[in-house]
Amino acid sequence: LVPHLGDREKRDSVCPQGKYIHPQNNSICCTKCHKGTYLYNDCPGPGQDTDCRECESGSFTASENHLRHCLSCSKCRKEMGQVEISSCTVDRDTVCGCRKNQYRHYWSENLFQCFNCSLCLNGTVHLSCQEKQNTVCTCHAGFFLRENECVSCSNCKKSLECTKLCLPQIENVKGTEDSGTT
């Protein structure tokens, strides 16, 4: 025996891929709108066309959908140093990035700031600067890494983390001071 589908089961059954349930009649599956368009009117009945309209300037949809409105195009954040890599089209949002010799630092999932890649002065490049990561520097002897810059051990204070790295230097300075000259 084939079990009878009640209203709830019918309501819960999903439409095939590329279609969605008509909001007023869950026995009708309407075809979704293509990317670059949005839903203006649901299909009137089974096998009938959904009324989709193209997104207006300044808006987009990047995938097939049944959205009542297109999404607003993102704006690149000048105050964060961002530049436009590619402009918004009806089917693709604006792509923002950084200038050459800069990297992105993400303060949160959807917010990044552009910073200049470190040049590793008084050190060597351990890992080159990448799109989302600053250069990794290794400092020469007599220098320590502070805020990704190689700083002279003469700027190392006892309270700072640099004391271990600069210990031989500090001892040498002390030794020179302590040794009396005749």
């Epitope: 954040r77 000048k78 105050e79 964060m80 630092h105 303060w107 700031q113 910073f115 600053n134 805020e147 990704n148």
Partner: nanobody, 119 residues
Framework: EVQLLESGGGLIQPGGSLRLSCAAS????????MVWVREAPGKGLEWVSH????????YYADSVKGRFTISRDNSKNTLYLQMNSLRAEDTAVYYC????????????RGQGTLVTVSS
């Protein structure tokens, strides 16, 4: 010397409102993008909101969007954060800061003001 002094924090019931202020001195306030960040107990620093130099472009974290409003008065060298419909998860120390320029760390930020949302 750069100084940022936050005020306006306190104990507030869920659903309530608070207005934080940040008095700035020692630099040209109108030339800087300003930021509000917060640090909840046992959590890292979270970017809450920022406002550009002229107050035209603003940003809000998803967690505060529609509830918080950032503003500034360049004639008074003051940054504000209007916080409405407060929730327990908004409990944190709130700091104002100058947008970093050299790298992803805050060279200049205030001492913070504690906001506690509890019934």
């Amino acid at each position: 010397e750069v100084q940022l002094l936050e005020s306006g924090g306190g104990l507030i019931q869920p659903g309530g409102s608070l207005r934080l202020s940040c008095a700035a001195s020692g630099f040209t306030f109108a030339h800087e993008t300003m930021v509000w960040v917060r640090e909840a107990p046992g959590k890292g620093l979270e970017w809450v909101s920022h406002i550009d130099r002229v107050g035209q472009d603003t940003y809000y974290a998803d967690s505060v969007k529609g509830r918080f409003t950032i503003s500034r008065d360049n004639s008074k060298n003051t940054l504000y954060l209007q916080m409405n419909s407060l929730r327990a998860e908004d409990t944190a120390v709130y700091y104002c800061a100058i947008l970093p320029k050299r790298g992803p760390w805050f060279d200049y930020r205030g001492q913070g003001t504690l906001v506690t949302v509890s019934s």
